[in-house]
């Protein structure tokens, strides 16, 4: 057979569906490696063939499209799952061809097993928002196509796994979920049941969102550094141990990029000739408020090193702060003795 | 085809019991299996069910103190925890052949074996 | 959480006569229910499924209707070999059950 550009598999798509339930996918060709549409391809006389590699298989082998109640189907670029069995779990590759022209693509999916209560080894999407801020809305996601809008599904949500009914800010509106004035409490998983016929048969897709209540924009500050401040000396004797943290305090912003580091006399650490290592840790409040904590230190410090300028830095989307630390020579008391 | 159930006795309060569902001529990887029970003059209460694919679903008081599993000839139910209120037939079904709803249809049922709880 | 009302709990009617049983579901499950039938100290036994198509071996003077929310079992020209219990059980969903099945109608033939 000709050459075919092969794009290899396509991790970044790790298509995880759940066992038991419809799933509709896109031939990612048309999505994210070719420059024109399904449609287009069609009435250039491409055609569109898929197959499959068991897992833990190494043959390449086509999809059956004569299972019973047409399990398996193909439907322009999209591949239907009526419903997904457990042992569906496979790299799939969709093949765009004809006598001179060739592309493929493979992409791995996971039919993953839920119990009662939505539990599973699915990744969710997490939705942030804002504490005690306005009204939040969250629809129930991945749904489109599934049925045509002549269908009027049921909706059913749950945290956790108790159905919501008359939750005090919190209200289901057919695929939306809203939140009123959300609070801290309103974390954890909420998942939507879409219950839809078709031809006589009764479907079921279960989507989960991750809901994250963080700190308002409202609240919003520059970077607040704790330490090192002006109320503590670091004073040490040459060949000590000197170890001086920075510590700050970055409230949540959506999507901020929040920084800290150190400068030794105007240069970064890597810049100077110290022996000084930097060890950074973080920790989240519930709103997840972050606080970054950079401890520099140098094992044997010497008299030079106790006369260099130690500055603190920090900087989010608000803004920049720095802070030196008060780095002093320890004098010792000269020593008399009485003959 | 046929369904059986094995393993029921009488037990005192706390004791786990575990009962088994034996299959005869049914592949499992093709059936959904229910466990079903019911108390003396009572009515019929689901206890949960294992589809073809393995996964578990249980009714909400069932959750936690029961617990399904199979093989491939065989459906257990494991019960922790048994109360006098646990006291009942506990029945195997099979589902309806189908890839969707009709597994919860209970076209074939065992005969049910008996759990008394008592001190 | 999902319910099933099943009404009424027990009736009785002459040979030759005509029941009704009626079952309700707490949200739709469109045509996703099953009856029952049980006789004393024996198994439970598929009568109808899909609301109202007849399991194999079953009478055609069993019929069931309905979907939605509202279900109907009617046993025209009851015998009295129909003198058992009869159940309706919803297949549509297993989330958030207490119990998919009804609570059980008891018909007794004169």
């Known amino acids: 057979s000709e050459r075919c550009d092969d794009w290899g598999l396509d991790t970044m798509r790790q298509i995880q569906v759940f066992e038991d339930e419809p799933a509709r996918i896109k031939c990612p060709l048309f999505e994210h490696f070719l420059k024109y549409n399904y449609s287009t391809a069609h009435s250039s006389g491409l055609t569109l063939i898929w197959y499959w590699t068991r897992q833990d298989r190494d043959l390449e082998e086509p999809i059956n499209f004569r299972l019973p109640e047409n399990r398996i189907s193909k439907e322009k670029d999209v591949l239907w799952f009526r419903p997904t069995l457990l042992n569906d779990t496979g790299n799939y590759t969709c093949m765009l061809r004809n006598t001179t022209y060739c592309s493929k693509v493979a992409f791995p999916l996971e039919v993953v097993q839920k119990d009662s209560c939505f539990n599973s080894a699915m990744r969710f999407p997490v939705h942030k928002m804002y504490i005690e801020h306005g009204i939040h809305k969250i629809t129930c996601p991945n749904v489109d196509g599934y049925f045509p809008s002549s269908v009027k599904p049921s909706v059913t949500w749950y945290k956790g796994c108790t159905e919501i009914v008359d939750f005090h800010n919190v209200l289901p509106e057919g695929m939306n979920l809203s939140f009123f004035i959300p609070l801290v409490s309103n974390n954890g998983n909420y998942t939507c049941v879409v219950t839809y016929p078709e031809n006589g048969r009764l479907f079921h897709l279960t989507r989960t969102v991750t809901v994250k209540v963080v700190g308002s924009p409202k609240d919003a500050l520059p970077p607040q550094i704790y330490s090192p401040n002006d109320r503590v000396v670091y004073e040490k004797e040459p060949g000590e141990e000197l170890v001086i943290p920075c510590k700050v305090y970055f409230s949540f912003i959506m999507d901020s990029h929040n920084e800290v580091w150190w400068t030794i006399d105007g240069k970064k650490p890597d810049d100077v000739t110290v022996d000084i290592t930097i060890n950074e840790s973080v920790s989240y409040s519930s709103t997840e408020d972050e606080t970054r904590t950079q401890i520099l230190s140098i094992k044997k410090v010497t008299p030079e090193d106790l006369r260099r300028n130690y500055v603190c830095h920090a900087r989010n989307t608000k803004g920049e702060a720095e802070q030196a630390a008060k780095v002093k020579q320890k004098v010792i008391p000269p020593r008399y003795t009485v003959e | 085809q046929s369904v059986e159930e094995s393993g029921g006795r009488l037990v005192t309060p706390g004791t786990p019991l575990t009962l088994t569902c034996t299959v005869s001529?049914?592949?499992?990887?093709?059936?959904?299996m229910s466990w079903v029970r019911q108390a003396p003059g009572k009515g019929l209460e689901w206890i949960g069910s294992?589809?073809?694919?393995?996964s578990t679903y249980y009714a909400t008081w069932a959750r936690g103190r029961f617990t399904i599993s199979k093989s491939s000839t065989t459906v257990d139910l494991k019960m922790t925890s048994l109360t006098t209120e646990d006291t009942a037939t506990y029945f195997c079904?099979?589902?309806?052949?189908?890839?969707?709803?009709?597994?919860?249809?209970?076209?074939?049922w065992g005969p049910g074996t008996l759990v008394t709880v008592s001190s | 959480a999902f319910e099933m009302t099943q009404t009424p709990s027990s009736v009785s009617e002459p040979v030759g006569g005509t029941v009704t049983i009626k079952c309700q579901a707490s949200?739709?499950?469109?045509?996703?229910l099953s009856w029952y039938q049980q006789k004393p100290g024996q198994r439970p036994k598929l009568l109808i499924y899909?609301?109202?198509t007849l399991a194999s071996g079953v009478p055609s003077r069993f019929k069931g209707s309905g979907s939605g929310t509202e279900f109907t079992l009617t046993i025209s020209g009851v015998e009295s070999a129909d003198a058992a219990t009869y159940y309706c059980?919803?297949?549509?969903?297993?989330?958030?059950?207490?119990?998919?099945f009804g609570g059980g109608t008891e018909v007794v033939v004169k």
């Open positions: 079904a099979r589902g309806c052949p189908g890839y969707n709803g009709d597994k919860y249809t209970f076209d074939l």
């Open positions: 899909r609301a109202s």
């Open positions: 001529g049914i592949d499992l990887s093709n059936y959904a």
């Open positions: 294992v589809i073809s694919g393995g």
């Open positions: 059980q919803q297949g549509a969903t297993s989330y958030d059950i207490e119990n998919p």
């Open positions: 949200q739709s499950i469109y045509n996703y």
